[in-house]
Interface confidence: low
């Protein structure tokens, strides 16, 4: 249980003292419009902040941009607004950081009307400086960094042409026209799809996508009546449309385009839409929307082809084309993933796997929460996960839930104890084992930031009053220290953290406002001196992920290995620090059904862990074609989950079947082909 | 640089089967498909089949179906070719050439085929009794 | 399956000439061929793909056009290390075929 700041609390001594000596104002003179806040590369203490505008604007009204720059974490600013030259930035593009430590920072300026093209700044020094250069089109999105190559720039124009720089935005080049989207892929190769009539709303579902590997000098196209593309892990996906209907269809190419296959999912119709919810190496997690306005659909789980798929959960909510999912990756904890169903009753309901989308369950009541109005029964009920959905609705949730990958086993957010997600203002809720066990954290909405890999949880209400109050936990949310950082309360509007969550540096913003006049203002606390000695071997204990049977010889194991990890005591008050590295012992587990999906062909009968043969597969929206004809596919029914690692225990071996099946798709097969030669 | 060394020369009898290596180095071995050709004593190219190293998906020529198997270990990014059921006109050079194509066509006015770009040195197999 | 057919079967070109070599496909194959370069004792050479592109590597005396059934490979000057047999081969529909050779030699 959680007990709050009741007695069994161990307080932090002296953390009053400490914070106060580590807590820097800084006032911003002058910033006006939106405020957006970056870092600049990993660990290197650098912050910038812009005021930026939208366009058109009223000139004489606000004044040029302003941008500033901080190399201590945001304990101090300095206002370099002339390294560009007072020019208006456009909100919408923002600041493009570069990819790892590259240093690089691109601005891209509103310049007046009648030019030729747009203008950016650009800087390679971690924003020391800035050049200006004048580009030959006018930017229509941000500039895009290559991943592999942080000199290799692309952009869109609003001309629809394909402009490219190989020299971090001095030169650019236009490489095509009439481009709708372009993406980069691996090894600095771009793909992006092209129209050829009118433009790309009115030729969506004939557009040709398109690849080339050395930037603009040559093309192939790869893929032609294409809806759209998407990228995710080492797959390549394009929605096509079919030949006689307006259905479309998922492609996937694990080659960068050379080669594609038909993915076993159903086809979808005008207005209906498929979305990539996760990817990876392995596999992938797709939504299928079904058909009408439902707001929901259903996920699948890919193979390691990204070919097969199984039905993963049904009814999952995912509003209607661009909307909103709170599908959400627990990256604390490996193969934990959570979003919410819309049950018949229109409720929504949060479900969590723990094994990658095999399996889905509701989350364990707390213990020291009770059940709610939504709950049937007042023993018995479930805690809801409020996510983007309940965000996108302006139910009071300032945050959608957090956790990282180096704070193991932490997730943190709003939630609800019910049988459904409640209307009521809800609570923060934290899980230290990745999901399985939850506890009240904090009553009423908060904005919450993990620090120094988890030793640290910092939390401030969310109040429509001015506020001058930050919480603190040291023991992952179990107790809570409170610390007013100023005399003069402000009207909050962020709570920010270097990326990754090694930082001990919190900075909080908001601004003052009195009858005339309202400024910025930033607050960064240094929680070093909290954690005021280095973290030994002592102060960490062993701890079995996914450990549900301590009993069970086969406890922890999922998808096909369990691991150990090296995690801080909660009752240690010390710092995991920078360099920290997550300590883990990973095992193989052997073999079972569990571990394989059923290939093509083959399904789970209910409650059964055996694949069994489709009676037929006729009126089944099951197609297979690798290769853009009829396809010998041979298979025991049985396919290793992906990423799955077991060894040993069962082998699902049985008689090899031979299947055949008709390629019926237009877009993997030229000429209609059958399995005899011609 | 990008290479497929394949296994030394076999002498076989009617009858018996030969397994082929390939091994590919230089590059990521699931990015590409990989062919396999053949070339009897003064005749020219025949192209037996194919394998996609992602899956292990295959497609073979009709005249090989049923005699030929193409298996791959990606732990050692290698490819196999069996070929079972051996007679004296199967005496030839076994080729493996890596084929960034693959066999699925993107569709009418988009096909671009890359063409077998690496080959293996080749592997003599003799059937004599 | 689709049927390549390479014309002449043998070339006989002196050094520095122009070479032309034919290959007519039994249904159209698009732009989707490739030739290759073959010397005695030694594994085939990716010349042109695509119908018409180079491969990495291959000089500029190479070319390739044509699409749909009728291709040719065109060498502008015979050099000394070009006599070889040259094939073509579709990737249209599988399976994937070869032309039956052409062997260019000094004359």
């Known amino acids: 249980s959680a007990p709050g700041e009741d007695e069994e609390c161990g307080r932090v001594r002296d953390f009053v003292a400490k914070l106060a000596n580590n807590t820097h104002q800084h006032v911003f003179d002058d910033l006006r419009g939106s405020v957006s806040l970056s870092w600049v590369g990993d660990s290197t203490g650098v912050i910038l902040v812009l005021t930026t505008f939208h366009v058109p604007l009223v000139i004489m009204t606000f004044g040029q941009s302003k941008l500033y720059r901080s190399e201590d974490y945001g304990k101090n600013f300095k206002d370099i607004t002339d390294l560009i030259n007072n020019t208006f930035i456009r909100t919408e593009f923002g600041m493009a950081i570069g990819p790892e430590n590259s240093g690089k920072v691109v601005l891209t300026a509103e310049v007046s009307g009648g030019s030729r093209g747009g203008r950016i700044f650009r800087s390679s020094d971690f924003a020391k400086n800035f050049v200006q250069t004048d580009l030959p089109f006018h930017p229509l999105t941000q500039m895009m960094y290559s991943p592999q190559n942080s000199d290799y720039l692309l952009a869109l124009s609003t001309e629809n042409g394909l402009w490219v720089s190989k020299n971090f935005g001095g030169k650019w080049e236009e490489i095509h026209k009439a481009v709708c989207l372009a993406k980069w892929g691996s090894d600095n190769t771009i793909f992006f799809t092209t129209y050829a009539n009118g433009s790309c709303k009115a030729d969506l579902g004939a557009l040709e996508l398109w690849r080339t590997s050395d930037l603009g000098k040559s093309f192939k196209t790869i893929g032609v009546k294409i809806y759209s593309f998407g990228l995710g892990g080492r797959f390549l996906f394009a929605s096509v449309m079919a030949d006689k209907d307006t259905t479309r269809r998922i492609h996937v190419s694990t080659d960068q385009g050379d080669t594609w296959s038909m993915a076993q999912l159903p086809s979808v119709g005008q207005e209906q839409f498929y979305s990539i919810l996760a990817a990876n190496d392995d596999m992938v997690f797709m939504h299928v929307d079904e058909p009408g306005d439902t707001g929901f659909g259903t996920i699948f789980t890919s193979d390691d082809r990204g070919i097969v798929y199984s039905k993963s959960l049904d009814r999952h909510l995912y509003t209607t084309t661009g909307g909103e999912t709170d599908f959400t990756n627990v990256t604390s904890l490996r193969g934990v993933y959570i979003t919410s169903v819309l049950s018949e009753d229109n409720s929504i309901q949060t479900m969590i796997t723990f094994d990658q989308g095999g399996r889905w369950t509701h989350l364990r009541k707390p213990e020291n929460s009770e059940c709610d109005a939504t709950a049937k029964n007042k023993n018995e009920c479930s805690l809801h996960i409020h996510a983007s959905y309940s965000i996108s609705q302006k139910l009071n949730v300032p945050m959608a839930p957090l956790s990282e990958p180096n704070a193991v086993g932490i997730v943190i957010a709003h939630g609800s104890v019910g049988d459904a997600i409640s209307v009521m203002v809800p609570d923060v809720y934290i899980s230290d084992d990745g999901g399985y066990s939850w506890t009240k954290m904090l009553e009423g909405p908060h904005y919450y930031t993990i620090l120094d890999s988890g030793g640290i949880i910092v939390a401030i209400e969310h109040s429509s009053r001015p506020i001058n109050v930050i919480k603190f936990s040291t023991d992952e949310g179990q107790c809570w220290q409170t610390y007013t950082f100023t005399r003069d309360p402000i009207y909050f509007t962020g709570l920010a953290s270097e990326p990754g969550a090694r930082s001990m540096n919190i900075s909080i913003w908001g601004f003052t406002a009195s009858f005339l006049t309202s400024q910025w203002v930033s607050y960064t606390i240094d929680f070093k001196d909290i954690l005021e000695r280095n973290c030994e071997e002592k102060d960490y204990t062993i701890w079995l992920a996914h450990s549900t049977d301590p009993e069970d010889y086969e406890d922890g194991c999922i998808l096909g290995y369990k691991e150990q990890f090296l995690r801080l005591r909660k009752s240690s008050v010390c710092q995991n620090g920078r360099d920290y590295v997550v300590t883990k012992q990973p095992s193989i587990c052997l073999c079972s059904l569990e571990d394989f999906l059923c290939d093509f062909g083959y399904y789970r009968p209910e409650n059964d862990s055996k694949c069994v043969e489709q009676p037929e597969l006729k009126g089944h929206d099951l197609e297979f074609c690798l290769y853009g004809r009829e396809e010998h596919l041979t298979t025991n029914g049985y396919r290793k989950i992906p990423g799955d690692k077991c060894q040993g225990g069962v082998n699902p071996v049985r008689e090899v079947k031979d299947l055949k099946k008709k390629c019926t798709s237009n877009f993997l097969s030229p000429e209609k082909q059958n399995s005899k030669s011609n | 640089q990008v290479q497929l060394v394949q296994s030394g020369a076999e002498v076989k009898k009617p009858g018996a089967s030969v397994k082929v290596s390939c091994k590919a180095s230089g590059y990521t071995f699931t990015s590409r498909y990989m062919s396999w050709v053949r070339q009897a004593p003064g005749q020219g190219l025949e192209w037996m089949g194919i394998i996609n190293p992602v899956g292990g998906s295959t497609s073979y020529a009709q005249k090989f179906q049923g005699r030929v198997t193409m298996t791959r270990d990606t732990s050692t990014s290698t490819v196999y070719m069996e070929l079972s059921s051996l007679r004296s006109e199967d005496t030839a050079v076994y080729y493996c050439?890596?084929?960034?194509?693959?066999?699925?066509?993107?569709?009418?006015?988009?096909?671009?085929?890359?063409?077998?770009?690496?080959w293996g040195q080749g592997t003599t197999v003799t059937v004599s009794s | 399956e689709i049927v390549m057919t390479q014309s002449p079967a043998t070339l006989s070109v002196s050094p520095g000439e122009r070479a032309t070599l034919s290959c007519r496909a039994s249904?159209?194959?698009?732009?989707?061929l490739a030739w290759y370069q073959q010397k005695p004792g030694q594994a085939p050479r990716l010349l042109i793909y695509g119908a018409s592109t180079r491969a990495t590597g291959i000089p500029a005396r190479f070319s390739g056009s044509g699409s749909g059934t009728e291709f040719t490979l065109t060498i502008s000057s015979l050099q000394s290390e070009d006599f070889a047999v040259y094939y073509c081969q579709q990737a249209r529909l599988g399976p994937w075929t070869f032309g039956g050779g052409t062997k260019v030699e000094i004359k």
């Open positions: 249904q159209s194959v698009s732009s989707n």
């Open positions: 050439a890596r084929d960034p194509s693959g066999i699925a066509a993107a569709g009418p006015a988009s096909r671009y085929y890359y063409g077998m770009d690496v």
